[in-house]
Interface confidence: medium
């Protein structure tokens, strides 16, 4: 039960996280104009990964896309790449985790396969979250560097003359959305990995005591059971008895006089 809850919660947290990463990637406010000396401006500039915008006091807003690819800073391209990789990995992870959910039965999919898929999606969520956090952090570092460079330029006036005006940009809402979303995806991934660890052992413990020997001629060997964690070669969950290996289906098709525990 706890494993199902952990897996379900991990899925939901990751889902929220990935939705947040997508939202952050699409948002225009990655960097917003620093209103250091004028808290209410007539014109407010802000920039995203894909376009930059200007909003006026009249309400008029225009955004223009970055139509060049080669002319963009390498760092911006890197941030774009990290965010896209994060979204793609997260989306695949979500798809895999849906089939891995313990509460959803799909055909005759065994729990070892679900454990495998849970771990895979967990790792994908972790990498997705790290990509998002890395992307946002790289952009934030870029902003900090540019901010202090433009601040230095602002105050290098000589002989009573002031240098040309420079617009400084500071952290936009998208950065905080990205950091939180990346963190949630990361946490969700860790929860999925924890759920995976609990999936297989819980099942094998149950199966180890599920069956009794069908007759006196067959001696039950507790040590003979090979636990399947989903990573070994015993993927068929075969129970090993002295009387030969029989599959789970075979055991169930010959009920003994003993009741199941």
């Amino acid at each position: 039960m706890a494993v199902t809850a952990c897996q379900g919660l991990g899925f939901v947290v990751s889902l929220i996280g990935i939705a947040g990463i997508i939202a952050a990637t699409c948002m225009d406010q990655w960097s917003t104009q620093d209103l250091y000396n004028n808290p209410v401006t007539a014109v407010f500039n802000y920039q995203g990964l894909w376009r930059s915008c200007v909003r006026e006091s009249s309400g008029f807003t225009e955004c223009r896309g970055y139509f060049t690819l080669l002319g963009l800073p390498a760092m911006l391209q890197a941030v774009r790449a990290l965010m896209i990789v994060g979204i793609v990995l997260g989306a695949i992870g979500l798809l895999v985790s849906i089939f891995a959910l313990k509460c959803i039965r799909i055909g005759s999919m065994e729990d070892s396969a679900k454990a495998n898929m849970t771990l895979t999606s967990g790792i994908m969520f972790i990498v997705s979250g790290l990509c998002a956090i890395a992307g946002v952090s790289v952009f934030a570092n870029m902003l900090v560097t540019n901010f202090w460079m433009s601040t230095a330029n602002m105050y290098t006036g000589m002989g009573g003359m002031v240098q040309t005006v420079q617009t400084r940009y500071t952290f936009g809402a998208a950065l905080f959305v990205g950091w939180v979303a990346g963190g949630l995806t990361l946490i969700g991934g860790v929860m999925m990995c924890i759920a995976c660890r609990g999936l297989a052992p819980e099942e094998t413990n149950y199966k180890a005591v599920s069956y009794h020997a069908s007759g006196h001629s067959v001696a039950y060997k507790p040590g003979g059971f090979k636990a399947s964690t989903g990573f070994g070669s015993n993927t068929k969950n075969k129970k090993i008895y002295d009387g030969g290996a029989r599959t789970e289906d075979e055991v169930q098709s010959y009920p003994s006089k003993h009741d199941y525990v």
């Epitope: 000396n37 004028n38 808290p39 007539a42 014109v43 009249s58 225009e62 005006v165 617009t167």
Partner: antibody, heavy 122, light 110 residues
Framework: QELKESGGRLVTPGGSLTLTCTAS?????????MCWVRQAPGKGLEWIAC????????TYYATWAKGRFAISKTSSTTVTLQMTSLTAADTATYFC???????????????WGPGTLVTVSS | AYDMTQTPASVSEPVGGTVTIKCQAS??????LAWYQQKPGQPPKLLIY???TLASGVPSRFKGSGSGTQFTLTISDLECADAATYYC????????????FGGGTKVVVV
Amino acid sequence: QELKESGGRLVTPGGSLTLTCTASGFSFNSNYYMCWVRQAPGKGLEWIACIYGGTTVNTYYATWAKGRFAISKTSSTTVTLQMTSLTAADTATYFCAREDLTAYSSYVITLWGPGTLVTVSS
Amino acid sequence: AYDMTQTPASVSEPVGGTVTIKCQASETIYRNLAWYQQKPGQPPKLLIYAASTLASGVPSRFKGSGSGTQFTLTISDLECADAATYYCQQAYTRVNIDNAFGGGTKVVVV
């Protein structure tokens, strides 16, 4: 970077006139608003209208200029001001001006043309 | 709506003196105010924007202050070259306004 006005001349009352502003050294873009400001002889500056330099069409007019004056972009380097129903009160030097939106975060005029004189007289 | 009132209309001061020009907005424009200097036969030149920030190449003798509706331009250590007409301009909105500029102040340096 320069602005140059043209089209100013003597006009009779009730007449119409179109002024043209040509930019050199830069082209209109989303960082700018292109404006017209006038100054009657011996009087102060009077703002008339502005047009956005970006792709979206956005214009602003002084309340008194709406209807009689029309600002438009004819190319990426030229802006015009169409004036109708002119009176003697419209006699002034008409300046073409550029507001630098992005850098100054407000409607600050950073570049002016030398002006063109419009005289309305019979 | 957003009318700009400039005082005085003219002022006369000796070289080395100080001139103070006031500008009042009918509604708050926060710090979105610019000051221009215009000499006869020339177009205006930007001096100050954002109420107190000096434009490129403007000497520090020019000082802007104020916010909201009350603004001041102070010119200290007056020079002959400062003789001109000074205009304030609200740079906050372009919607429903009669004129963005104040009436102007003529500064005479004696």
